[in-house]
Interface confidence: low
Amino acid sequence: REAAPKSYAIRDSRQMVWVLSGNSLIAAPLSRSIKPVTLHLIACRDTEFSDKEKGNMVYLGIKGKDLCLFCAEIQGKPTLQLKEKNIMDLYVEKKAQKPFLFFHNKEGSTSVFQSVSYPGWFIATSTTSGQPIFLTKERGITNNTNFYLDSVE
């Protein structure tokens, strides 16, 4: 059977969802007036950078858009960005596309995404509404790094 990405609604413990604003992702409160993105997730077939303790290596994309999450250094700081890329193009590559890879780890009923390119840096939402989704190395009260993934048919 041909591989296909799994689709998820994603939210954090404060009921913030991910919203596409232009070509960037922001966190916004779950409400009828907001259209949250559906996250596409597919496992990487290449095991070059695998680390089972950190989780499964996955590519993350936005359903219905040729946009994928990737990590790059800007002014010396790891930064989360969206790049025009079809998630299946990443999947079919024999060699793992490191900037686009994340370790997906389960913590209880939540999911955590750690950059493969920048170990110790996690996808996070701010506790303030309307802020971009970003990478942080400080997990805790001021940043939400644990997400609920609700499967979408």
């Epitope: 404060r14 009921q15 409160p29 779950l30 409400s31 009828r32 907001i34 009923s109 509404s129």
Partner: antibody, heavy 122, light 111 residues
Framework: ELQLQESGPGLVKPSETLSLTCTVS??????????WGWIRQPPGKGLEWIGS???????YYNTSLKSRVTISVDTSKNQFSLKLSSVTAADTAVYYC??????????????WGQGTLVTVSS | ESVLTQPPSVSGAPGQRVTISCTGS?????????VHWYQQLPGTAPKLLIY???NRPSGVPDRFSGSKSGTSASLAITGLQAEDEADYYC???????????FGGGTKLTVL
């Protein structure tokens, strides 16, 4: 039609643990896109949300009660329960269980139990 | 003290229109969280009256309507009837508290 029924002791001694169960009929507690909650109302006062558990098993608690509250689901009995530890007279209230739907956003608690009065007294 | 502020009481004569306000802040209503309204008749459990700011569940008369603007929400009742005499509560989500919050409730008296 979904129906909820609270059950548990009507009298609890101070410092003990209040335990209530909500039995769900007319639907499955494991159904996708539902969340289940507990709300209380002290005599003559307003409503206070205690906490909720959603269809993923994720729990959410009122920050002022968090250290004392546990909400859990028993799928085999189609029930969810509330445990509130170290109770005082201030926990005397009518306790309601309620449910609502989640579809991109929360749609309010649209089904409620009839409520059960719990008195904390020695 | 409730996170959402409602007037303790409102009143109106049969046939009149009354409104009940619910004032929040930038961490709940003002942060685009939905507002829900409940009606609690004496001695009974609350009943969902309005969900998602302005939507009526089936069976709720169109005399009841909800609206939201900025950090506040309102419930309007037109053609007031004796059976509308009840307590009314607004509810939203507050991200600074990571949970649901209710207003203190408003007692509606039909004169």
């Amino acid at each position: 039609e979904l129906q909820l029924q609270e059950s548990g002791p009507g009298l609890v001694k101070p410092s003990e643990t209040l335990s209530l169960t909500c039995t769900v009929s007319g639907g499955s507690i494991t159904a996708s896109n539902y969340y289940w909650g507990w709300i209380r109302q002290p005599p003559g006062k307003g409503l206070e949300w205690i906490g909720s558990i959603d269809y993923t098993g994720s729990t959410y608690y009122n920050t002022s009660l968090k250290s004392r509250v546990t909400i859990s689901v028993d799928t085999s009995k189609n029930q969810f329960s509330l445990k509130l530890s170290s109770v005082t007279a201030a926990d005397t209230a009518v306790y309601y269980c309620a449910t609502g739907k989640y579809y991109e956003t929360y749609l309010g608690f649209d089904v409620w139990g009839q409520g059960t009065l719990v008195t904390v007294s020695s | 003290e409730s996170v959402l502020t409602q007037p303790p009481s409102v009143s109106g004569a049969p046939g009149q229109r009354v409104t009940i306000s619910c004032t929040g802040s930038s961490s709940n209503i003002g942060a685009h969280y939905d507002v829900h309204w409940y009606q609690q008749l004496p001695g009974t459990a609350p009943k969902l009256l309005i969900y998602g700011n302005d939507n009526r569940p089936s069976g709720v008369p169109d005399r009841f309507s909800g609206s939201k603007s900025g950090t506040s929400a309102s419930l309007a009742i037109t053609g007031l009837q004796a059976e509308d005499e009840a307590d009314y509560y607004c509810q939203s989500y507050d991200y600074s508290l990571s949970g649901y919050v209710f207003g203190g409730g408003t007692k509606l008296t039909v004169l």
